[in-house]
Every structure is written in C-alpha cells, then in structure tokens.
Interface confidence: low
C-alpha cells in the first residue's frame, strides 16, 4: 500500500481585483509556518470573470451574483475544502468604482452592497469589499513587485529581472496602467516629497522606506481614449472624426451620450449638433501623439517639478517595473524586450499605426476587433505618458522593465493588498523562527 502524504501545512487567500474593465480573482498560497518570511507567498490561480467591470452593473445589480459565480466556484475547487472556512476573501475596487462614486455615492454603495452579499454566500472567510484609494493601489503594487523580486529580503533573491546587479536591495519603482487610472510609485533619491498627499512612509522587514506615489484618475488607457475623443470632437466640423490613433480604413460609430457618460470627459463636454459621430482612422503616430499630449496640462506646476496637471513628481530614480496594461499592450506589440530602445519602440509604433485596418484584421484574426482597434492608441498613449507625462528619456527608457509575472505571480496591487491585510509584512526583520509581530504596514 502507498504511504499517504502528510497534509501540507499551507494557507490560502483570495483577492478580487474589481477593475474598470473587468474583474479578476487571484488565489494565493503560502507555507503556514513561514508567514513572516519574504517571498514565500505565490499565486496559484488567476480567474478572469466574464463580463465588464462591476461599475457597469449599476442598472442591473441583480446580475452581480451570477457574474461572480464561475470564478468563486473555481476557488472552491482549487482550495481544499478543509481550508475554506479559514481562507480570507478580499475584494478591492479601483478607478472604475472611484468614478462611479464621484457620480453617485448611492449607486456605488448599492453595487458594493450586492457584491458583499454575493460573496458572503460562499464558504470562505469573507473580509469585505471596498473601493481602494489611488494611493493604496500605487503602494500595494510597489509592495507586490518588490516582495516578489526579493527586495525586502536580506537573502539573495530568487530571480533577477535585469541582466546586471547594481544594488541588490535597491527597490524597483512601480508603473501601473489600468483602464481608468494609472499609478507611479518609487523611492526618490534623497529628495523631499514636496506634496504630502504623495508621500508614504513604510517600515518593512526592519528598513524604512520613503515612497512617492500618485494615481492619475481618468488617465487609464480607456478613460484617456474617451478624453481624447471628447477633446477632438469639439473641433470636428461635422459628425466625422478623422482620428490618427486608429488604423487607416477603420470606422466606428460612437454615441455622444456614451462619450459624456464618464466624469473624465466633463471638462470637454459641449452641446454637439449631432447624437452620434463616426471615427474614421487615418493611422498617423505623430499626429496621435500630439493629440494625446493635449490631455496633459504641463503649463502649471506649483512645485520644483511636476508630471502633469500640477502634480508633483520627483526626479526618476532606479529601475521600474511596468505592469498591468503597460505590459499587456507592449506584449501584444512585441515591444517588451529589454533590448528594444525607445527610438525603436517609436519607430515600430509608427509602422504599426500606419498599417491598414483590413491588413491588421487579417494579421491578428484571433483578436477581438474592439481590443485590436485600440492598440495603436494604447501603444502611443503609453509612450506619451512615460516620456512626456513621467519624463522618462531615451536613456532612462532602459530602466523600464515591462513585467507580466514574477515567479509565476502577476505583478499588480492584489498581492501587496493581501500581504498587508493578513499581516504578513512585518515591520521588523523576522528572526529565524517565526514570531508574532504587532507592527505592520
């Protein structure tokens, strides 16, 4: 007879990332006796919920339960039944819900209330659903990538993402791009963080970190596109918008009511003499880039230096991990390689945007047209945001590393969020035997 393996002494945690365009469920696992070690938590599953982000359910909240079912059932299968009751479940909603809350606190609360009631029906230890702040989103993303890169550990890290080792313990900055917001978070070099709203202090594993973070609401790739369209339709002489950010030959009808639905386009709202307009792609990277730059107000800065819209940004320092849509878009465009210079990226974007829509559809037959049509804009937007928004240069471009996963775990805010809420990042460096810690992030 075979020997039965001893049951693993492991723990699990679930985090749902309720983003503006979709919801993803992540399952994390770690050895129970090593909770306070750095780098022991890893992702065992990602389940993408079918459908849009939860903010889109505002008029059909009764459908939220069904919407979450598949991924919650998947969690039930992956996590051993004996562990269900002690597995914490957290849902964090990001910029899509921040925008809904700006429009109506009541509607946002109604959505979260139904989400909470739906998640409470499962046998896990549900810990609540909340809209996290942009500052939290930035901070937890920074914690995630540095935890996975072993930056908080005194031991050598498992995994090197750069071909050279400068200072092993120097943290990476985090660049996160979502559908509705984008975050930049890093430790500046001996620089005062002039704006208190952008300053975070952490003590992690016995070391102090002074971290700069900012979340630009309305500057995620989807909301940036809505902003650009709302801005450009103001000068259109009729209901045809010749748009350089879409491929030549591409056509799409847009409802004006959809354009002005989001708070992000309020600043460009005007009474138009038509209810619909047609985007006609002309595929010109340079013109697209110029149009995008008009979304960034760089004329006003009350600090020693700014990103855009009067927001303080210290001089960039060190290496940066660029993840979420930064990674997905650049991966699709085949531009994530460390060897591709900024000049080369720009060159390739020029060629890509100029390709006729019919040709693009043929080349990428398996990709949904809605997503396929927006890669020219998204790629151009990423370049504009990084270069003109955050002031990366051709030289500092090589310090940006487009990251999807690190050691099998997705780069993003969810892991850092769970580590914090489960008290798994101690303020002091743990001794060789696990101790109980009272001070956490």
């Amino acid at each position: 007879t075979q020997n039965k393996a001893l049951p693993e002494n492991v723990k699990y945690g679930i985090v749902l990332d309720a983003g503006s365009s979709h919801t993803s469920l992540y399952i994390y696992k770690w050895p129970a006796e090593k909770e306070n070690d750095t780098g022991v938590v890893h992702q065992v599953e990602e389940c993408r919920v079918k459908g849009p982000g939860i903010s889109k359910f505002v008029q059909k909240v009764n459908e939220i339960g069904i919407y979450l079912t598949d991924c919650m059932e998947r969690a039930r299968e992956v996590i051993p039944r004996s562990q269900h009751q002690e597995t914490p479940v957290y849902l964090g909603a990001t910029a899509g819900m921040r925008l809904l809350r700006m429009e109506s606190e009541e509607l946002a609360d109604r959505v979260l209330d139904v989400v909470e009631r739906s998640l409470s029906n499962y046998p896990f230890d549900f810990q609540g659903a909340r809209i996290i702040t942009g500052q939290e989103e930035g901070a937890y993303g920074w914690i995630t990538i540095n935890y996975l890169l072993g930056k908080f550990s005194q031991k050598t890290r498992w995994f090197s993402i750069v071909p050279y080792e400068t200072n092993n313990q120097e943290t990476f900055g985090a660049l996160d791009l979502g559908g509705a917001s984008t975050q930049v978070t890093f430790v500046p070099q001996n620089q005062t963080i002039e704006s208190p709203d952008n300053a975070l202090q952490f003590r992690l594993y016995g070391k102090d970190y002074n971290v700069y973070t900012h979340s630009f609401l309305c500057y995620g790739k989807d909301q940036a596109l809505w902003q650009k369209l709302a801005k450009d339709i103001q000068v259109a002489s009729n209901e045809i918008l010749r748009d350089p950010c879409f491929h030549p030959g591409y056509k799409k009808v847009v409802n004006v009511s959809d354009l002005y639905k989001t708070p992000c386009t309020k600043r460009f709202e005007m009474t138009l003499p038509f209810q619909q307009f047609e985007i006609q792609g002309i595929g010109n990277y340079q013109q697209c880039h110029q149009s995008i730059l008009e979304l960034f107000n760089t004329s006003y800065c009350p600090y020693s230096q700014c990103a855009f819209n009067g927001i303080f940004l210290p001089p960039l320092q060190g290496d940066f991990g660029a993840f979420s849509a930064f990674y997905f878009v650049m991966k699709f465009l085949n531009l994530t390689s460390e060897k591709v210079s900024q000049e080369k990226v720009t060159e390739m974007m020029k060629k890509f945007c100029a390709q006729p829509w019919e040709e693009i559809k043929t080349s990428y037959a398996g990709v949904k047209e809605k997503y396929l049509s927006e890669y020219c804009f998204s790629g151009t937007y990423i370049l504009s945001l990084l270069l003109q928004g955050y002031h990366f240069t051709a030289d500092s471009w090589e310090h940006i590393h487009f990251i999807g996963k690190i050691q099998g775990s997705d780069a993003g805010w969810t892991l850092g969020y769970m580590l914090n809420l489960t008290n798994m990042i101690p303020a002091e460096q743990p001794l060789s035997t696990p101790l109980s810690h009272s001070t956490y992030v």
Epitope: R101, M102, E103, S104, E105, L217, C218, K231, D232, Q234, V235, P263, K266, R267, F268, E269, M270, S291, E294, N297, S299, Y300, N309, G310, I311
Partner: antibody
C-alpha cells in the same frame, strides 16, 4: 439648477484662521469644480484657488496659507485661510467652474459671498 | 501667470448708446485643440456676486440679453453692450481660464452719461 450657499460673516483677529464653507444643492457635487475668489473693499476680483476631481490648485500668492477641501458626503467645499492680516479683509466668494482642467464655461454659478473682517 | 489688462477703467455712455470694453491678455488664451478662447466676461453690481455674461470669448451664458456680445481671439478681446440700459450700470471684468492661476482684469466701471 445648482445653487451655492456660503457660511455667514466672520470677524477675526490678526494671526488667526478662518474657514468658509460653500454648500452646493441641485447638482452632482462630486463633478463640480469649485473656485474661491476674493474681493477686498473697493477692489477687483482675485482668484485664490480651486478644487476639481479631488485635486486642489492654489494661486502662488496664497500657497501655504490657504487650504481648499471638499466633502462629497455633505456637498460642501471649504476654504481655510490662516495667518490672517488686515489686508485679508474682503468678501470671499465660491464659484462653480475654473480653468481648462476644471470647468469649461468660466464661473457660471456663484455663492452670495462671505465677509471676513480682520481687525485687532 | 497671465496678466489681464482692461481698458478703460471707467466709461460713461448715454442710454441706448453702444459701450465697448477692451481686454488684453499677456499671452494667448486660444486652445489649439478646440480652437476656443478660454476667456470669460462678468458683470458685478454693488453688493452682489459677479454674474457670468460670456464664456469662450463670444458665447453668451444662459439668460443673458443679446445686447451683450463678446469678440476677439488670442490676446485681444472686446465686450460690447449694443444699447446701454439703466440696469447695465455695473463693473465688468474679463477673466482667463486657460492657465492656472486664473486671473481677472482690473475691471471697467460703466455709468450712464
């Protein structure tokens, strides 16, 4: 129709602070950019700062002395001015609207004004 | 910041006559992406808050009589009252909302001759 109602007149000593409130009704407050403008006796209008999309901007002249905040739960914006001096005696107005990045149409709705007198 | 200069400081016009106020900005307030001038005109009567008359340099605000009109582009702007009425006695201000800090002209006092 949006209306802005401001708090009442204040008499303050030099060196103290004043906090003026501006309550909005009849509109979605969270998407209202709010500017604060003051007018000294017999003088013109002077923009102090504004708040929109949660971000405050201040005129250089008032930087460090003025704080503009908004409480969405009560649809109220606040302007606090510290280290008051006699030349801060003025009528303080809140108004909906502002700059290119906070309101497209100038300042189209104004509060009734709050008189602040700074005197020892 | 952008300096707004208004002229004249005061103006006395007979009832039913035309009143013209000028406003000059130290730099252009024309936003190229939408070809709009970020300039507004306000009217302020004694003891009252200012009232928006014109935005985007030439668009009348809701409820403003059509005797008020705005014109100009870039750096030079004009507010015209085509036929002055008694109720138009007030101080008029121009204001740019193109760049922070927002700035107002010094004001023009309009009286009846």
């Amino acid at each position: 129709q949006v209306q802005l109602v401001q708090s009442g007149a204040e008499v303050k000593k030099p060196g103290s602070s004043v906090k003026v409130s501006c309550k909005a009704s009849g509109g979605t407050f969270s998407s209202l950019p709010i500017s604060w403008v003051r007018q000294a006796p017999g003088q013109g209008l002077e923009w102090m700062g504004g708040i929109g999309f949660g971000t405050a901007n201040y005129a250089q002249k008032f930087q460090g002395r003025v704080t503009i905040t908004a409480d969405e739960s009560t649809s109220t914006a606040y302007m606090e001015l510290s280290s008051l001096r006699s030349e801060d005696t003025a009528v303080y107005y809140c108004a909906r609207g502002g700059a290119k990045y906070a309101g497209r149409y100038g300042m189209d709705v104004w509060g009734q004004g709050t008189t602040v007198t700074v005197s020892s | 910041g952008i300096v707004m200069t208004q002229s004249p400081d005061s103006l006395a016009v007979s009832l039913g006559e035309r009143a013209t106020i000028n406003c000059k900005s130290s730099q252009s307030v024309l936003f190229s992406s939408n070809n709009k001038n970020y300039l507004a005109w306000y009217q302020q009567k004694p003891g009252q808050p200012p009232k928006l008359l014109i935005y985007w340099a030439s668009t009348r605000a809701s409820g403003v009589p059509d005797r008020f009109s705005g014109s100009g582009s870039g750096t030079d702007f004009t507010l015209t009252i085509s036929s002055l009425q008694a109720e138009d006695v007030a101080v008029y201000y121009c204001q740019q909302y193109y760049l922070y800090p927002l700035t107002f002209g010094g004001g023009t006092k309009v009286e009846i001759k």
